[in-house]
Interface confidence: low
């Protein structure tokens, strides 16, 4: 589960690489592109048919400390009348991101990238209907 | 993960905030543990909002492949499979995190950046705006 | 689970080609992948394919040699490998996974075939 090196089709490695020990790397946590802000349609949350809602989680050992995950609110789908339709399921959009994580050894700190998957929000999809002989 | 040395007075000297630069392993640690296996991967065709993935490849970005998702109508996919333009389709959008190679084309040199992604689609009930 | 069992490996000649199948028992809209093996080696990625076959990810040791598709209506994956060289002697897989992010990472990839051995030598 290593980063692929840049293969050698694309480039020559540049002479001006910083020097970095076997097996890590070295990665600069000033984020590029940080103040870049979602421009998302207002509330889609609670306007879609399948509606969700949001729970940050803080964890002050990994970087970004918040994450925040959508939970559906339903099983279904909100049809035109406002009522819930059990023959339509709310499904879970899911993006992986990376995180970095700290770890504490005694007296010592490592750090390790970690892929976390965020559920970013629900979609109404018709159900696969599993037909039993 | 590589290990380095904290201050002399350890116990008492936690720092709270992180480095600018970092070590790292090369090995990404994976803790996928809330996915669920059974979840299928054709939400972009069975939903009423339904998106096409746009592949977007950068060989100094890691992961150098990331899908964009598109909806594929303004509008949303009814009961009987036409499109209903009183629901109007619109991208989810996620902020995620991703490495640059920094210098450029170094094999283990790497800078965090925060990019815009379109993840999927869902159906929503338009804001009708009334102009008196 | 799904079920698959792949068929097609061998042994042929550098420069040869082979065409890799794997039959899913069950519909499967997941994306798949190929994955190999070699003697004394990791388990490495190969090709994936989406769902709907649309959209398609080779490694590089692999790209403009081997081609991955997919035929929904029979529930089959496929693996057409062409210029076969020896470095591609392995034990190959078909697995499900859950998208196309990250598709390099074998511990991805959720249901597994029994695999098939491809031997290119002379």
């Known amino acids: 589960r290593k980063i692929p090196k840049v293969g050698h089709t694309f480039f020559q490695k540049p002479e001006s690489c910083p020097p970095v020990p076997g097996g890590s790397m070295k990665l600069d946590i000033g984020i590029i592109n940080e103040n870049q802000r979602v421009s998302m349609s207002r509330n889609i949350e609670s306007r879609s048919t399948s509606p969700w809602n949001y729970t940050v989680t803080w964890d002050p050992n990994r970087y970004p400390s918040e994450v925040v995950q959508a939970q559906c609110r339903n099983l279904g789908c909100i049809n035109a009348q406002g009522k819930e339709d059990i023959s339509m399921n709310s499904v879970p959009i899911q993006q992986e991101t990376l995180v970095v994580r700290r770890k504490h050894q005694g007296c010592s700190v490592s750090f390790q990238l970690e892929k976390v998957l965020v559920t970013v929000g629900c979609t109404c999809v018709t159900p696969v209907i599993h037909h039993v002989q | 993960g590589i290990t380095i040395p904290r201050n002399p007075g350890c116990p008492n000297s936690e720092d709270k905030n992180f480095p600018r630069t970092v070590m790292v392993n090369l090995n990404i640690h994976n803790r996928n543990t809330n996915t669920n296996p059974k979840r299928s991967s054709d939400y972009y065709n069975r939903s009423t909002s339904p998106w096409n993935l746009h592949r977007n490849e950068d060989p100094e970005r890691y992961p150098s492949v990331i899908w964009e998702a598109k909806c594929r109508h303004l509008g949303c996919i009814n009961a009987d499979g036409n499109v209903d333009y009183h629901m109007n389709s619109v991208p989810i959008q996620q902020e995620i995190l991703v490495l640059r190679r920094e210098p450029p084309h170094c094999p283990n040199s790497f800078r965090l950046e925060k990019i815009l992604v379109s993840v999927g689609c869902t159906c929503v009930t338009p804001i009708v705006h009334h102009v008196a | 689970d799904v079920q698959l069992v792949e068929s097609g490996g061998g042994l042929v000649q550098p420069g040869g080609s082979l065409r890799l199948s794997c039959a899913a028992s069950g519909r499967t809209y997941d994306a798949m992948g190929w994955l190999r093996q070699a003697p004394g080696k990791e388990r490495e990625f190969v090709a994936a394919?989406?769902?709907?076959?649309?959209?398609?990810y080779y490694a590089d040791s692999v790209k403009g040699r081997f081609t991955i598709s997919r035929d929904n209506s029979k529930n089959t994956l496929y693996l057409q490998m062409n210029s076969l060289r020896p470095e591609d002697t392995a034990v190959y897989y078909c697995?499900?996974?859950?998208?196309?992010?990250?598709?390099?990472?074998?511990?991805?990839?959720?249901?597994w075939g029994q695999g098939t051995l491809v031997t290119v030598s002379s």
């Open positions: 394919i989406s769902g709907s076959g649309d959209d398609t």
């Open positions: 697995a499900t996974r859950r998208g196309l992010y990250y598709v390099w990472d074998a511990n991805d990839y959720e249901n």
